[in-house]
Amino acid sequence: MAVTACQGLGFVVSLIGIAGIIAATCMDQWSTQDLYNNPVTAVFNYQGLWRSCVRESSGFTECRGYFTLLGLPAMLQAVRALMIVGIVLGAIGLLVSIFALKCIRIGSMEDSAKANMTLTSGIMFIVSGLCAIAGVSVFANMLVTNFWMSTANMYTGMGGMVQTVQTRYTFGAALFVGWVAGGLTLIGGVMMCIACRGLAPEETNYKAVSYHASGHSVAYKPGGFKASTGFGSNTKNKKIYDGGARTEDEVQSYPSKHDYV
């Protein structure tokens, strides 16, 4: 039960994360015009990975695509590549994880195969999340560098009468969406990898051995408390005297307020 929950939750978290990565990649607000300590302009500039936009006070917004590939900064190309790789890996991971879900039965698929698929998708989600985080972080670093360079330029070369206002850019909403989405995908991937451990069949064959506990003359046989599924359940089904501790599968879970996000 806990394994299924962990796997299911990992899938959902990754799904939200990948949707966020796609949204961030498509968003136009990767960098937005810095309005702090700037003359108040009636024009607001913002830029994405694919186009730059200008919104006028009139409400008119004009966006122009970057219709060049070679003329773009290498860093921007790298960010694009990282985000696309993240999306592709995430999409493949989602596809694989659907078939790996314990709650979905596809033919006579071995549980070991499901475990392998869960691990594969988990790794894919982890790499996808890392790609997104890396892409967003590279872009953020680029912004910080350019911000301070343009700030320096604002206070130099003003010997003449005419001043040119340098448009400075700061972090846009897409960066925060990307960071959160990348983090969620990463967490989802880790959860899938954890779930994989619970799905993997144990190699140990438990023999019917009599355990003689002091003061008790009871023979314990594995699988005596639950009907064995024949897949890694022996470890869970062993009842031990542990002062009333119960295995995860047996604990009654109650919904908490944090379950509803």
């Epitope: 008119f60 004009e62 040119t164």
Partner: antibody, heavy 118, light 113 residues
Framework: QIQLVQSGPELKKPGETVKISCKAS????????MNWVKQAPGKGLKWMGW????????TYADDFKGRFAFSSETSARTAYLQINNLKNEDMATYFC???????????WGQGTLVTVSS | DIVMTQSPSFLTVTAGEKVTMSCKSS????????????LTWYQQKPGQPPKLLIY???TRDSGVPDRFTGSGSGTDFTLTITSVQAEDLAVFYC?????????FGSGTKLEIK
Amino acid sequence: QIQLVQSGPELKKPGETVKISCKASGYTFTNYGMNWVKQAPGKGLKWMGWINTYTGESTYADDFKGRFAFSSETSARTAYLQINNLKNEDMATYFCATLGYGNSLAYWGQGTLVTVSS
Amino acid sequence: DIVMTQSPSFLTVTAGEKVTMSCKSSQSLLNSGNQKNYLTWYQQKPGQPPKLLIYWASTRDSGVPDRFTGSGSGTDFTLTITSVQAEDLAVFYCQNAYFYPFTFGSGTKLEIK
């Protein structure tokens, strides 16, 4: 077609209040901001500020902060300019104008002459 | 505030002549985001409200005759009327449409001989 029709001329005494209206037609009122421009007799144009007719937020030029207030009534498709505590230097023609491409003042009202005389 | 300086203040020309008027701003009106200059030209005929002629420094508004041409970039702008007509008698204003507060030039009064 887009039209801005302003209220008629006003004759006021110093210290009084005047409220000029600007009724819009031919477009979605909340889609375009409304600007106000002052033109003293025989003088040039002076931008007073504008009101975002969607949010109701106003931006005023420094010379028009305090006694001047912009407002709008979406249901009536009308923008208003109110001048409190009128002074002699407020005697002018006041124009309303909508923002267009390039933040230009694309469509203008016919103007409202405010005369301040004791 | 941005200062808009127009020259000359008065222009007297004969019909059919080419006329050029200048407008200078104290700061660049070029927006790097779209490479457009936020400079607007208006024509105000006697007893009428101003009429939009040109926005983005060089884009003619719909219905404006093609004898009106706007040019320039950054801080220096020009309005050219290739063949002045009798109905062009008016005051022409340039306006900063980039920085708040929007500011107008003092105007160039065009008179026909």
